[in-house]
Interface confidence: low
Amino acid sequence: EINGSANYEMFIFHNGGVQILCKYPDIVQQFKMQLLKGGQILCDLTKTKGSGNTVSIKSLKFCHSQLSNNSVSFFLYNLDHSHANYYFCNLSIFDPPPFKVTLTGGYLHIYESQLCCQLK
């Protein structure tokens, strides 16, 4: 049965920054993942495969990111209160055949303890 709050943890805080975890089905071979803040595209990452199974990773709006076989992590640094907002992971799949995927988003709460360089 589904658990009450079954969504995976989307925000992971560390050292005044946050890792935003965007998961995707791991049968997906080629895709574009965008991180949206409200309706604004903050980051994107595109993974494509060429001949000989060579993998190409491209970013039009570059953020520090990390790719695994079923997730893309985007990293935001130097957090301040302006980072508080709704964030969404928007996934476009090229292979297998195209359709659009929107993964569950969430609200990023910013607390004093998570800010980068607090004055003591």
Epitope: I2, D26, N70, V101, L103
Partner: nanobody, 124 residues
């Protein structure tokens, strides 16, 4: 609505074997990882074994290596745990977990689902 239906637990003597199965059903688009966890009385839930969708083993707990085997039938959306050479310390409630993507219209959502658990008791 997605459900994980577990079966196969029970009472067994030390050295015996059991096979657990966990079948996912519902409006499933894709399943990423599937795995087995266990929780003994007074202890935290721990990973026993896990598989990626391709069927390659991601992890076995050290305490079950060489005794337990996890396998998966992607066509049936089912994961199995073959438990051999069982020991009293394997006594626990065993839970299956799956990261499942479901479809709602044109949107897909990735969520963790858990089975309700099945009791495995190993004693003479």
């Amino acid at each position: 609505q997605v459900q994980l239906q577990q079966s196969g637990g029970g009472l067994v003597q030390p050295g015996g074997s059991l096979r657990l199965s966990c079948a996912a059903s519902g409006s499933i688009f894709s399943i990423n990882g599937m795995g087995w966890y266990r929780q003994a009385p007074g202890k935290e839930r721990e990973l026993v074994a896990g598989l990626t969708s391709g069927g390659s083993v991601t992890n076995y707990a050290d305490s079950v290596k060489g005794r337990f085997t996890i396998s998966r039938d992607n066509a049936k959306n089912t994961v199995y745990l073959q438990m051999n050479s069982l020991k009293p310390e394997d006594t626990a409630v065993y839970y299956c977990r799956a990261e499942i993507f479901t479809r709602t219209g044109e949107n897909y959502y990735g969520m963790d689902y858990w089975g309700k658990g099945t009791q495995v008791t190993v004693k003479p």
